[in-house]
Interface confidence: low
Amino acid sequence: IRAEKAMVDGSWLDLAKRSKLEAQPFAHLTINATDIPSGSHKVSLSSWYHDRGWAKISNMTFSNGKLIVNQDGFYYLYANICFRHHETSGDLATEYLQLMVYVTKTSIKIPSSHTLMKGGSTKYWSGNSEFHFYSINVGGFFKLRSGEEISIEVSNPSLLDPDQDATYFGAFKVRDID
Amino acid sequence: IRAEKAMVDGSWLDLAKRSKLEAQPFAHLTINATDIPSGSHKVSLSSWYHDRGWAKISNMTFSNGKLIVNQDGFYYLYANICFRHHETSGDLATEYLQLMVYVTKTSIKIPSSHTLMKGGSTKYWSGNSEFHFYSINVGGFFKLRSGEEISIEVSNPSLLDPDQDATYFGAFKVRDID
Amino acid sequence: IRAEKAMVDGSWLDLAKRSKLEAQPFAHLTINATDIPSGSHKVSLSSWYHDRGWAKISNMTFSNGKLIVNQDGFYYLYANICFRHHETSGDLATEYLQLMVYVTKTSIKIPSSHTLMKGGSTKYWSGNSEFHFYSINVGGFFKLRSGEEISIEVSNPSLLDPDQDATYFGAFKVRDID
C-alpha cells in the first residue's frame, strides 16, 4: 500500500503540475515599432511582438494583430500605452489631443466587437515645452471564451512610444469558469 | 484501504496546501517618507516599508532598496506613484515637469539593469493653482528568476506623496515557469 | 488497489476542482449610471452593477454600495475611473479640478475606514476645448478578511463617464492567508 500511496501521490503531483500549467495561459505583447500606423485617427494596433525581449505567450495565440483565447476562463487583462512627442519631430497638427486606448473583445461566433476597458486623457501639448509624454494604464478581470479575440485600439498612433517598456498589453488566466 | 485513502487525501491536502503557499510569493511595499531623496533628477527609491500598514512580504526579500526574487516564476508586477505640490511648500524650480516612474529589473549574475515598465506624464503645474496632484499606475506580467531584483526609479522625488495609499509597488507570483 | 487508486484520484480531482473554485472569489463591478451623485465634492459611489454586461461576482457579496469579502485571503484590487465633460453639458463650476479616486476598506468589527489606494490628477479643463476626458487606474495586493468591505470614493462624481468600460472596480483572490 505504501508503494501504491507513493504512486498515487506521484501520479497526482504530475497531474496537478501539468493541469496547473495548462490552466494558466498568459501573454505579454509589446509594440512592434516598425509598423506603427501614422496619423491621429483611432486605429486598431496590429503589430505586436510575442517572443522577443519582455514579450511572451503561452496557451494563447497571436494572429492578425489579435490575441486569441484558446482556453475558457477568467483572465486579468491589462494595457499600458505611452504617447510622446518631441519638437524635433515637427509640429503637432493640433495642440489639443485626445490620447486614448480601448481594449476590445471580438467574438467570431457572433461577429461583434465590444470595448472591455478604456482610458486616456485630453491633453494640451503646447509649443511651450519641447517634450511631451503621457501614459495610460488600464486593467480588469473578464470572462473569456475560447476563440474570442482581444485587440487594442488607440487614437493618435503616430505619437506612440515604441519602447517595449512603454507600450504593451497582456493577459493571464486566474481561474476556470465554474 | 479507507484509512489509507483518508491518509492519502490528508497527506496530499497538506502537501497541496503547503506547495500552493510556497508557490505564491508576494510583496506590497509602501514608500518610507522619512527618507525620500530631494531634487528633480531621476533617482532610484531605496526606502520602502515591508511590514507596517498595508506593506507586507512573503517568500521574497527586501534588501538595499530592492525587491529580491527568491523563487522562479511568472509574476504580476505593479506600481502606483503619486506626486503632489502645494504652494505652501514654496515655488517649483520649474512649472514644466516630467513626472515619471520606471520599474527596473537587475540581474546579479549578468550585472545589467533593464526597464520592465514605464509610465508618467509631462505636466504644467502653473502658479495659478494652489495645489497640484498626479498619479501614475503601471502593471505587467513578467518572468522573474531567483536572485533578480526589482527596483523603482522616479523623476522629481521631492514631489512624491508619502502616504501608503499613494506611493507603493508590489508583485505576486501567478504561475511557475514550465 | 487500482480501483481504489482511481477512486482516490477521482475524489481528489473533485475536491481539488471544488476547493480551487471556492478559493477564488472575484468581482468586477461597473458603474450604475442611473444613480450617480451630482456635485463636485468627494462622495462614496454606492450604485454599481454586479450582474449585467461585463459586471460579475462570485463568492463575494455586493450590498449597500460596498463589495463585501466572504473569504479571507490576499486579493488583487483594482479600479478604473473615467471623468469627462462636453461643452454641450454647460460650463464647469471651475476650470481647475481635482479628479480623484480612493479605494477604501471598512472593517465592521472595528468600525473604521482606511484608504488602500488613491490616484488622480489636478486638471485645468479650459473652455478652449469642447471636450475633456481623464482616466485613473489604481491596483494593488491586499490582505482582506471575511466581513471587510471595499468601497469607492471619488471627487466630482457629476463628471463620471457612465460607460461600463470606463468606470469600474474589482477584485480577485490570489491566495490564502498562511
Epitope: S38, E87, D91, T94, E95, S126, G127, N128, S129 | - | N128
Partner: antibody, heavy 115, light 107 residues
Framework: EVQLVQSGGDLVHPGGSLRLSCVGS????????LHWVRQAPGKGLEWISG???????YYTDSVKGRFTISSDNAKNSLYLQMNTLRAEDMAVYYC?????????WGQGTLVIVSS | DIQMTQSPSSLSASVGDRVTITCRAS??????LAWYQQKPEKAPKSLIY???SLQSGVPSRFSGSGSGTDFTLTISSLQSEDFATYYC?????????FGQGTRLEIK
Amino acid sequence: EVQLVQSGGDLVHPGGSLRLSCVGSGFTFSHYPLHWVRQAPGKGLEWISGIHTGGGTYYTDSVKGRFTISSDNAKNSLYLQMNTLRAEDMAVYYCARGRNSFDYWGQGTLVIVSS
Amino acid sequence: DIQMTQSPSSLSASVGDRVTITCRASQGISSWLAWYQQKPEKAPKSLIYAASSLQSGVPSRFSGSGSGTDFTLTISSLQSEDFATYYCQQYNSYPPTFGQGTRLEIK
C-alpha cells in the same frame, strides 16, 4: 461671440514694409494658435504663417526671413510684420484662429504692392 | 509640402441636388482635413474639421468623409445660399496647405 477684427492693409511700394494687426475677442486669446492666410486676386488660399501658444513661430518658405509673426496677449492682438514686400505678396490677408482647423477668420485686409 | 488636389475645379448644379466634391492628398494625412466655404469678397467659413466633424452652427446637409489620402465633401440637398467656392485643407503637418478650390455655380 468669437471675433477677429483686422487692420493695417495699405498700398506699399516693392521693397517697402507694412504691419498688419488682428484683435481677438470672445475667447481666451493666449490659449489658441493663430495664423495668417492670404489670397491673391482671383486665386486660392495660401497659409503663410502661424504662432503657437508657447510662442513657436512658423512660416511658409516664400516669406521666411521677410515676414515676422508675433502676438501680444495683454492686448489680445496678433501681428504680421512684412518687410521687403514684392509684387507677388499682393493679396487679401486673413488672420485665423487655429484649433481644429481654422475655425474663425478675420474679415480680411487688402495689401497692394505696386510701384 | 503636401499637395492637395480638388476635383472638379468647377461644377454646375441646381437647388435640391446632391453634390460631392473630392480632395486628394499627395501623402497620407490621417483625418487632419478641413473644408471651407468662401463667398465673393468674404472671408472663408469653416464647415468641417477632422475630415467628418461638423463645425458648430453648420447645417447638417453638409457632411465630410474619408481618411488617409482621399476625402469627400457632400451637400445632400443644395440650397441657394450654398453656391460658393469650397476649399479643402490639410493640417497634418506644416505648412498647412489648401486645395485649389471648387467653384459651385447655379445651373
